[in-house]
């Protein structure tokens, strides 16, 4: 059966806990990606930056888990409005962004 | 200015009942989350209660469910807590505390009163 | 219920830089904040939501939360920075708010 939005949020934000807490070097190499504006469509904007973010097995749970939240397939290459323009941040950096932005949506009840 | 003044605090023999107000002023107290926190002497905070903005959820800490009731009182921007079977250990500095309002309370508490002391002692 | 686990006491020399730790099983899924509490009075906000600082507290401190440990970090401390801190989460399996049992920090 599906699982609960509420449940699958908390799930997505102790994926991202684990990943800030296992790296011992550089989360996917040091790779870049977009930065995003956080306040809309966070899901999407988030999965569209990462995923162009390839051969970083830390990070494929996180890809496939965004995929869940997001409602339009999104691939490689496809950037929305919500990417912060010229402006990119380490994987590490977003994903401890992304983490507490998540964190203030379940405080907040916003599950989908 | 914004503030919180407590009430209500004094000795009390164990077994007995005690009521603390809090009266809020200069902010919407309709709006926030209301918490009661408490200190015993020498100690560290200890959570208590909470009440939701509308009056619509409370909370407690295990220490004190069923013996303490948070109510507040929109129309008057007072909040209270009634303390009955009070214990020797419900001695402590019990403050007022304002938290602005989400679906889940986990918002930091922004504004606290000064306090007022409960001395339970026979 | 959650139980969070703070150091009781820090000392650091004026101008050093002090670290007090707030441990919690997986705290980094949980919102942080931080008070700091002076001797005869009410608990003040310093840090919330892991790292948002309110206007009018100092950029010397600063906040982060990761795995298993939040970390309130006070840069370049001056005396008046000597009191009790205390790190908060809200306890979402139970509804109920848990504070560390503060740390007394002492400014040599």
């Known amino acids: 059966s599906p699982v609960p939005p509420s449940t699958a949020l908390k799930e997505l934000i102790e994926e991202l806990v684990n990943i800030t807490q296992n790296q011992k070097a550089p989360l996917c190499n040091g790779s870049m990606v977009w930065s995003i504006n956080l306040t809309a469509g966070v899901y999407c904007a988030a999965l569209e930056s990462l995923i162009n973010v390839s051969g970083c097995s830390a990070i494929e749970k996180t890809q496939r888990m965004l995929n869940g939240f997001c409602p339009h397939k999104v691939s490689a290459g496809q950037f929305s409005s919500l990417r912060v323009r010229d402006t990119k941040i380490e994987v590490a950096q977003f994903v401890k962004d992304l983490l507490v932005h998540l964190k203030k949506l379940f405080r907040e009840g916003q599950f989908n | 200015q914004m503030q919180l003044v407590e009430s209500g605090g004094g000795v009390v023999q164990p077994g007995r009942s005690l009521r603390l107000s809090c009266a809020a002023s200069g902010f919407a107290f309709r709006t926030y989350g209301m918490h009661w926190v408490r200190q015993a002497p020498g100690k560290g905070l200890e959570w208590v209660a909470v009440i939701w903005y509308d009056g619509s959820a409370t909370h407690y800490a295990d220490s004190v469910k069923g013996r303490f009731t948070i109510t507040r009182d929109n129309s008057k921007n007072t909040l209270n807590l009634q303390m009955n079977s009070l214990r020797a250990e419900d001695t402590a500095v019990y403050y007022c505390?304002?938290?602005?309002?989400?679906?889940?309370?986990?918002?930091?508490?922004?504004?606290w009163g000064q306090g007022t002391m409960v001395t339970v002692s026979s | 219920s959650y139980v969070l686990t703070q150091p009781p006491s820090v000392s650091v020399a004026p101008g050093e830089t002090a670290t007090i730790t707030c441990g919690g099983n997986?705290?980094?899924?949980?919102?942080v904040h931080w008070y700091q509490q002076k001797p005869g009075q009410a608990p003040v906000l310093v840090i919330y939501?892991?790292?948002d600082r309110p206007a009018r507290i100092p950029e010397r401190f600063s906040g982060s939360n990761s795995g298993n440990t939040a970390t309130l970090t006070i840069s370049r401390v001056e005396a008046g920075d000597e009191a009790d801190y205390y790190c908060?989460?809200?306890?979402?399996?139970?509804?109920?708010?848990?504070f560390g049992g503060g740390t007394k920090l002492t400014v040599l």
């Open positions: 505390v304002r938290a602005p309002q989400w679906y889940l309370s986990a918002e930091a508490f922004d504004l």
């Open positions: 997986l705290i980094g899924a949980y919102l």
């Open positions: 908060q989460v809200w306890d979402h399996d139970t509804n109920t708010m848990v």
């Open positions: 939501d892991d790292v």
